[in-house]
């Protein structure tokens, strides 16, 4: 899976969406890898 | 209202070095990476590199590798990017940009700074 | 480096036009491709992320499609304010890298 800063920003956006926001607090990109998708 | 305002224009001499700032206002800077892309006159669009204002790490195009420095000043949630060794070719106009998804996913880019080398 | 090459490079069109713009990718970039709209003297605007969707508050008539190597960017009916240069973006791999932009002029 594609790991660039641009990627992770989208995914981790995509997930929140998912979710409703109901995510921690620090589950921000800078905070995120991409092994934590 | 999320803001990207970079530093003014600057006329620089070959060989001497450039930083431009770029303030952020709206949004938490420290949770999303802050991209540097320049636009030579005429020219397509070119990505310098990014950096992760909360843990400082970097990634920068191979091309501007040791004459890019890509920093920030978190307290005053500010990025910066120098470039060194100026050469002609280096007159553009430089953007800080970042994608933020709160308050607003969306890709904000600042205004722009001219940076013109000339001798 | 990836090579991302556009096409046509300029084009005229007139209002109400469906305007179609291709960008092609020197390898897989799998969905990871942006476009931006850019006015003269100002910043680029992005439009499309991800290939395809649009970011909020972008015009329902901008779509975008593409995976893989092969990507558009469509105006289904072009109005004043969309003629500009249109670049793609791929953020797949780094260096990001752009397309040589698309300059839409009025016919």
């Known amino acids: 899976a594609c790991d660039t800063a641009t990627c992770v920003t989208h995914r981790l956006a995509g997930l929140l969406s998912r979710s409703g926001g109901v995510v921690k607090n620090n589950f921000v990109p800078t905070n995120v890898g991409s092994k934590a998708f | 209202e999320v803001q990207l305002v970079q530093s003014g224009a600057e006329v620089k001499k070959p060989g001497a070095s450039v930083k431009v700032s770029c303030k952020a206002s709206?949004?938490?800077?420290?949770?999303?990476?802050m991209n540097w892309v320049r636009q030579a006159p005429g020219q397509r669009l070119e990505w310098i590199g990014d950096i992760n204002p909360n843990q400082g790490g970097t990634n920068y195009n191979q091309k501007f590798k040791g004459r890019a420095t890509l920093t920030v000043d978190k307290s005053a949630s500010t990025a910066y990017m120098e470039l060194s060794s100026l050469r002609s070719e280096d007159t553009a106009v430089y953007y800080c940009?970042?994608?933020?998804?709160?308050?607003?996913?969306?890709?904000?880019w600042g205004q722009g700074t001219t940076v013109t080398v000339s001798s | 480096d990836i090579q991302m090459t556009q096409s046509p490079s300029s084009l005229s069109a007139s209002v109400g036009d469906r305007v179609t713009i291709t960008c092609k990718a020197s390898q897989n970039v799998d969905t990871n491709v942006a476009w931006f709209q850019q006015k003269p003297g100002k910043a680029p605007k992005s439009l499309i992320y991800?290939?395809?969707y649009r970011y909020s508050g972008v015009p329902s008539r901008f779509s975008g499609s593409g995976s893989g190597t092969d990507f558009t960017l469509t105006i289904s009916s072009l109005q004043p304010e969309d003629f500009a240069t249109y670049y793609c973006q791929q953020y797949n791999n780094y260096p990001y890298t752009f397309g040589g932009g698309t300059k839409v002029e009025i016919k």
């Open positions: 991800s290939a395809s």
């Open positions: 709206g949004y938490t800077f420290t949770d999303y990476y």
């Open positions: 940009a970042s994608i933020i998804i709160v308050p607003n996913y969306f890709d904000y």
